[in-house]
Interface confidence: low
């Protein structure tokens, strides 16, 4: 379908799309989320933790999971950013489209905080990112391959 | 345990209508479908297609619809009854599928961190021919 009206991303909910790495604009850094929880970005495009499973929830709401850690992305109300075993309300993103053709992953449960990668590859923490942020600027890329 | 039984399906022909209920029974909590419920369907030899969804939020929450059915298929609730709905519309042969509906749920939500999980329905036959 169309991108809807409000510029969130637009896919069928509850359905997969196939497998991502998510590609921040500042430093090049793919979203990494480690086995024991840990998330971070490396820029080997290789690393099997980057390879995130992106599943809508609702329209423009996405939780992404990484596919060889089997854990869900999630922002914890102190603003780090963490994977945790189980979906919770902490795991919900809006995906939102902007007008650069990057997307930004904003947490549902804590609003005005975004995923976000340091030009060092380290998570930035929620309450430090805003709008207009390049560290708040990811690319899907297919990861099928 | 929680459960959801789709009800409304059967034989209709071009151009009728059907409305689909899923009730929720169950529940922990009474607030299924408030974090969002859909409906799906797969015809015969066909994958899963979602049809319609409805998001968060107890007093509707945004819709999405699938290019196939706008403007014919309508996605509600009713909160109070626990119930999901699909009104459908000027129905087509190519509508025949068997329609599920599936529902988001939070299972503690006493706790800071919500436990969230998905529900499905058994699904219900709808057959448009004359």
């Known amino acids: 379908p169309a991108l809807p009206e409000d510029g969130g991303a637009a896919f069928p909910p509850g359905h997969f799309k196939d497998p991502k790495r998510l590609y921040c604009k500042n430093g090049g850094f793919f979203l990494r989320i480690h086995p024991d929880g840990r998330v971070d970005g490396v820029r080997e495009k290789s690393d099997p933790h980057v390879k995130l499973q992106l599943q809508a929830e609702e329209r423009g709401v996405v939780s992404i999971k990484g596919v060889c850690a089997n854990r869900y992305l999630a922002m914890k109300e102190d603003g780090r950013l963490l994977a945790s075993k189980c979906v919770t309300e902490e795991c919900f993103f809006f995906e939102r489209l902007e007008s650069n053709n990057y997307n930004t992953y904003r947490s549902r449960k804590y609003s005005s905080w975004y995923v976000a990668l340091k030009r060092t590859g380290q998570y930035k923490l929620g309450s430090k990112t805003g709008p207009g942020q390049k560290a708040i600027l990811f690319l899907p890329m297919s990861a099928k391959s | 345990q929680v459960q959801l039984v789709e009800s409304g399906g059967g034989l209709v022909q071009p151009g009728g209508s059907l409305r689909l209920s899923c009730a929720a029974s169950?529940?922990?909590?009474?607030?299924?479908?408030?974090?969002?419920g859909s409906w799906f369907r797969q015809a015969p030899g066909q994958g899963l297609e979602a049809v319609a969804a409805i998001g968060a939020g107890d007093r509707g929450g945004a819709t999405y619809y699938a290019d196939s059915v706008k403007g014919r298929f309508t996605i509600s609730r009713d909160n109070s009854k626990n119930t999901l709905y699909l009104q459908m519309n000027s129905l087509r042969a190519e509508d025949t599928a068997v329609y599920y509906c599936?529902?988001?749920?939070?299972?503690?939500?006493?706790?800071?961190?919500?436990?969230?999980?998905?529900?499905w329905g058994q699904g219900t036959l709808v057959t448009v021919s004359s």
């Open positions: 599936t529902a988001l749920y939070e299972r503690q939500p006493q706790l800071a961190a919500t436990k969230v999980a998905r529900k």
């Open positions: 169950g529940t922990e909590d009474g607030r299924l479908l408030t974090l969002g």
